[in-house]
Amino acid sequence: SERCDDWGLDTMRQIQVFEDEPARIKCPLFEHFLKYNYSTAHSSGLTLIWYWTRQDRDLEEPINFRLPENRISKEKDVLWFRPTLLNDTGNYTCMLRNTTYCSKVAFPLEVVQKDSCFNSAMRFPVHKMYIEHGIHKITCPNVDGYFPSSVKPSVTWYKGCTEIVDFHNVLPEGMNLSFFIPLVSNNGNYTCVVTYPENGRLFHLTRTVTVKVVGSPKDALPPQIYSPNDRVVYEKEPGEELVIPCKVYFSFIMDSHNEVWWTIDGKKPDDVTVDITINESVSYSSTEDETRTQILSIKKVTPEDLRRNYVCHARNTKGEAEQAAKVKQKGNGCTEPMTL
């Protein structure tokens, strides 16, 4: 047979579906690898073929499309399970070919079990919403294409294991869930269960979103340097260890890149001959404000080191800040005493 363009195993698409629920999986070729869509390919005489490798097996097998009640079927570029079974887990391949052309890609499909409280090994999307923001809506995800628009499914929303009924600031509205003036206590996993009829059978779709309430944009500030500051003097004798923490507060800003760095006499630590160690730690508040600490330490400080200029710098998307540390040699000149 002719050579086939093999895109390998597309591990970027780690598809997870719940056991005993419908699943529709589009062939990734048309979404990520080829420049044309299924309709164009089909009208050009190309055929889409599906096969799979079971979990812990090496043997590629054709997919059985003759199961009772058409449990597995193909429709255009979509592979349908109505519903999935646990042993459907494996690597699935879709291949587009004719006599002169061939292209294929494989992707892993994991069928996941859940308990009655929707706990499972499923990875959930995270939806960040701003604290005290007026109204925030989340929509039951990944349910498009499962039923025609003429079908009106029933939708039940849960927080954790509890059905959302008479929650004071959370209101279910069909496929949407509205949060009014959200607080940190609204953090958690929210699950929609969509029930729809098809060919005399009822199918359930379970989708979970993790809600994380974060700091509001109106509270976003440039970095605030807590330490070093003008009140603390690092007074050392030669040979002692010098330890200066640079502690910076960053308010939460969506997709912000928060940076902290030291300069010594205007140079980065890597560009000076001093034997410096820098350790960084990060902590987060309940609304994902960030406190980043970089501790600069010199094991045995020299008189020259005590004359250098140590500056802590910080940057986020709102601006920059810098603060010099007050460093002096003990008993050398009269500056203000060290305060803690």
């Epitope: 007026g134 004071h168 003036i181």
Partner: antibody, heavy 118, light 107 residues
């Protein structure tokens, strides 16, 4: 200096309506959520309603839901409470209060008395 | 809704003595608890937020502690101006709810 000044209270018959106002000064109203809290004579404090800083989100105590409407005009630095279908049990001093999730109700007005009686 | 219960309803204390007020939540409110002071004919005044942080201008004799469901307001040495009604309030979940109040009176 942060100041909140309520007005609009008075005597009203059961079933009647009243509109309370709260004028804010000394801070940008648009940065803060605002609430109404009431206190019946000789009783404790009861949260009535809240509105988000952007004015889009509103919440109400079950006891006033469907009868009271909170609103705000950030350009006028003013908070409102429209009270309809008033009942005797709505008789109270009504306070407006500024809130943040981090600090709760950090500033309060001096209150305005609403008396519902025939 | 979360029910806040304060005890005692009335506390009789001599000036200069320590006063300890308790507040219990019907479910965890984390550290999202505030204490207010109210004197007759006046609006409430924020004393403590975050269960233990003093609000601006509040004297150091006022301190708060606790987290979850059990909270305490302590006035280390009562001054004449401290005799008032004290309310706790949770702001963890909507609706925000108040305790019924503790009246601190002169013994």
């Amino acid at each position: 200096e942060v100041q909140l000044l309520e007005s609009g209270g008075g005597l009203v018959q059961p079933g009647g309506s009243l509109r309370l106002s709260c004028a804010a000064s000394g801070f940008p109203l648009s940065n803060y959520g605002m609430s109404w809290v009431r206190q019946a004579p000789g009783k404790g404090l009861e949260w009535v309603s809240a509105i988000s800083y952007d004015g889009e989100g509103t919440l109400y105590a079950d006891s006033v839901k469907g009868r009271f409407t909170i609103s705000r005009d950030n350009s006028k630095n003013t908070l409102y409470l429209q009270m309809n279908s008033l009942r005797a049990e709505d008789t109270a001093v009504y306070y407006c209060a500024r809130f943040r999730y981090y600090t709760a109700f950090d500033y309060w007005g001096q209150g305005t008395l609403v008396t519902v009686s025939s | 809704e979360i029910v806040m219960t304060q005890s005692p309803a009335t506390l009789s204390v001599s000036p200069g003595e320590r006063a300890t007020l308790s507040c219990r939540a019907s479910q965890s409110v984390s550290s999202n608890l505030a204490w207010y002071q109210q004197k007759p004919g006046q609006a409430p005044r924020l004393l403590i937020y975050g269960a233990s942080t003093r609000a601006t201008g509040i004297p150091a004799r006022f301190s708060g502690s606790g987290s979850g469901t059990e909270f305490t307001l302590t006035i280390s040495s009562l001054q004449s101006e401290d005799f008032a009604v004290y309310y706790c309030q949770q702001y963890n979940n909507w609706p925000w709810t108040f305790g019924q109040g503790t009246k601190v009176e002169i013994k």
